[in-house]
């Protein structure tokens, strides 16, 4: 059995109330295991977007190597985040708004060389990190898809897919597809090329749209396409609205595999106040699908806190020296260095959640059931067969609340126990590992809880 621990019990007469009972072999045999679903690598954990390689390097001493080579020096860090794939770039040559001077087969020398890229691919492979290349053509320009020359661009993309697949990339991303005429048919064609090369390759499409109908129409003709959008950023950050968005999406897409993020490219801090970052990390890592983050999400990187930094791509804060532009602007607790050394930091939470997400069957591919709870709360269960089960309770509100979990909403296969062990809280102060009575559960403002409980036959 995959990971299942069937405890074998010796049955005594006492257990049987003193009576002699005949117990058939069938009664003693462990229940049959549910067949495991086929899982691709992008099902097994988070994706990490590095849209701007230069910003990711940091300023100062971090900026010693060309960005692609510099990224190679950060792979151990990415391994420590337990992310499964790296969404990189765009890094191709693109003269703003000039189709003729846009070459999807050539790396812009500002980022490094093809040799650097090949070396990055090799190093990433050794560390089991997949590399997805963003091929959004006119990334420096106004319209990402040169709206007037769609066919020329589409041909360039086709050639690029074939070229980079041969070079060894694990997938592709194209963004701003709301600006691409006939997006559905182009995506279908690009998906065919990608999957034709290998079923193990991934195509990600990104849109700024938050409209469910538009999203569904893109997904309709594209099985296995992973789509990032602004769908969840419309939640107004309330529990009820978030719950309805999530459940609506899952129902509308027929529970097909999806991705979870707040946008196709931007940082979580663009949409969320600091006090909700932990809550959203917990949610994104525990919903059924692939969580997708942008570099810096793990430390709460916030462009607004860094004078002169662009909102869409602020400098990554490795340590206090990463932003020498304004002395004193960066404190230790804003950096990877400072947060790595603090078990209570956002980064430490990210690492723990990512670890759970990549190893627990119920989180890897378990069923999902949302159910009613107190106002402002969003709660759900993740479970798979006889594996450990998870209960997530999220308080989006500004006030402490009784959880008020309505277990009657749940199917028999996903019933709640009286108590569950606290795996983690997004807030300090709770004793991890302690059993909590679910009927008496109270949450602090903006608190999220991840609880675990065993399967019970």
């Amino acid at each position: 059995h995959h990971h299942h621990h069937h405890e074998q019990k010796l049955i005594s007469e006492e257990d049987l109330g003193g009576e002699q009972k005949l117990i058939s072999e069938e009664d003693l045999r462990a229940p049959r295991c549910r067949e495991l679903p086929a899982q691709k690598w992008w099902h097994t954990g988070a994706l990490y977007r590095i849209g701007d390689l230069q910003a990711f390097q940091g300023h100062g001493a971090g900026n010693l190597a060309a960005p692609i080579s510099g990224l190679k020096g950060r792979l151990d860090y990415l391994s420590s985040l337990k992310v499964k794939g790296l969404v990189l770039g765009p890094i191709h040559k693109n003269q703003k708004d000039d189709v003729a001077q846009t070459d999807l087969l050539q790396i812009d020398p500002n980022f490094g060389s093809k040799e650097d890229f090949d070396s990055l691919l090799q190093s990433a492979k050794k560390k089991s990190i997949r590399v997805i290349l963003d091929l959004t053509p006119n990334y420096r320009g106004e319209n990402s898809w040169f709206s007037t020359q769609v066919d020329t661009v589409a041909t360039k993309v086709k050639d690029a897919l074939e070229f980079w697949l041969q070079a060894g990339v694990d997938g592709f991303q194209v963004r701003d597809i709301e600006n691409l005429k006939d997006a559905s048919s182009f995506l279908a064609e690009w998906q065919n090329i990608t999957k034709g090369f290998s079923e193990d390759r991934l195509l990600i499409a990104g849109t700024n749209s938050s409209d469910l109908q538009q999203i569904l129409s893109l997904l309709e003709s594209n099985k296995d396409l992973l789509l990032t959008s602004s769908y969840l950023s419309d939640s107004g950050s309330t529990g009820e609205h978030t719950k309805s968005l999530v459940t609506q999406y899952l129902n509308a897409t027929g529970n097909r595999w999806c991705s979870w993020s707040l946008s196709q490219a931007r940082l979580l801090t663009s949409f969320l106040p600091a006090q909700l970052l932990r809550l959203y990390q917990l949610m994104l890592f525990t919903l059924p699908g692939t969580p997708v983050f942008s570099y810096g999400d793990e430390i709460g990187l916030d462009a607004a806190a860094l004078p002169g930094q662009p909102m869409e791509a602020p400098v990554m804060l490795w340590d206090e020296s990463s932003f020498p532009d304004i002395p004193g602007a960066v404190s230790a607790n804003m950096t990877v260095k400072g947060q790595s050394e603090d078990p209570g930091s956002l980064l430490s939470l990210f690492r723990r959640l990512s670890d759970q997400r990549s190893k627990e069957r119920s989180l890897l591919h378990g069923d999902f059931h949302a159910f009613s709870a107190g106002p402002g709360l969003f709660s759900y269960i993740r479970h798979w067969d006889q594996n450990e089960r998870f209960l997530v309770v999220l308080n989006f509100g500004d006030v402490g609340l009784s959880a008020g979990l309505q277990a009657s909403d749940l199917p028999a296969s996903a019933s709640l126990p009286a108590k569950a062990d606290l795996l983690l809280s997004t807030q300090p102060g709770r004793e991890e590992g302690s059993p909590l009575e679910l009927e008496r559960l109270k949450l602090e403002p903006h608190e999220g809880l991840l609880l675990r409980f065993p399967y019970a036959a």
Partner: antibody, heavy 123, light 108 residues
């Protein structure tokens, strides 16, 4: 194969100047930050200076600031160290090396050293 | 600046011995520590990065451990070619990069 070869060392009087060169081959020189490290006779290793891949960032150990200048010519795959106002305590074997970036959580697998060139400052 | 202190400064050992060299940083450097081996008249050779990761091509008898301020380099069974000087080096944050003063390992 990956190689760094230093040249330009020699015997020089205190107060005079010397320019060291380091020729790189076997890797994309223009993609890596480069360092100079020295070793005085019978002593340990001392980091001297570093330069970023494109020459835009330069750093020096305190004892050489204002006297030494690190530079590079990526078209020639060559690293330089211009040493002015030399002192007796600058006497050492000078190595050029690619060591990676001294920032948190950065680990370079591109760690290459030359064989060194000897600088002797003596009157 | 971060100071690196190695101990012992020198030690004598025999082929087949297990040898441990320690390195202490004046402040926490997480795991940003490298180890080098240098033979007389030669350039230093990179052995271990990130405190415990073996550089490719380095024999598995070499191992590194530690985090924060205290680190060790262990050679599980000394070979004749291992007699050399060993240096630790921190690359934790912002120049300067600093090396330990070295540990000379000689044949007993």
């Amino acid at each position: 194969q990956v190689q760094l070869v230093e040249s330009g060392g020699g015997v020089v009087q205190p107060g005079r100047s010397l320019r060291l060169s380091c020729a790189a081959s076997g890797f994309t020189f223009s993609s890596y930050g480069m360092h100079w490290v020295r070793q005085a006779p019978g002593k340990g290793l001392e980091w001297v200076a570093l330069i970023s891949y494109d020459g835009s960032n330069k750093y020096y150990t305190d004892s050489v600031k204002g006297r030494f200048t690190i530079s590079r010519d990526n078209s020639k795959n060559t690293l330089y160290l211009q040493m002015n106002s030399l002192r007796a305590e600058d006497t050492a074997v000078y190595f050029c090396a690619s060591l990676g970036a001294p920032t948190y959580s950065y680990f370079s697998d591109m760690d290459v050293w030359g064989l060194g060139t000897t600088v002797t400052v003596s009157s | 600046d971060i100071q690196m202190t190695q101990s012992p400064s020198s030690l004598s050992a025999s082929v087949g011995d297990r040898v441990t060299i320690t390195c202490r940083a004046s402040q926490s450097i997480s795991s940003s520590l490298n180890w080098y081996q240098q033979k007389p008249g030669k350039a230093p050779k990179f052995l271990i990065y990130a405190a415990s990761s073996l550089q490719s091509g380095v024999p598995s008898r070499f191992s590194g451990s530690g985090s924060g301020t205290d680190f060790t380099l262990t050679i599980s069974s000394l070979q004749p070619e291992d007699f050399a000087t060993y240096y630790c080096q921190q690359s934790y944050s912002t120049p300067p990069i600093t090396f330990g003063q070295g540990t000379r390992l000689e044949i007993k």
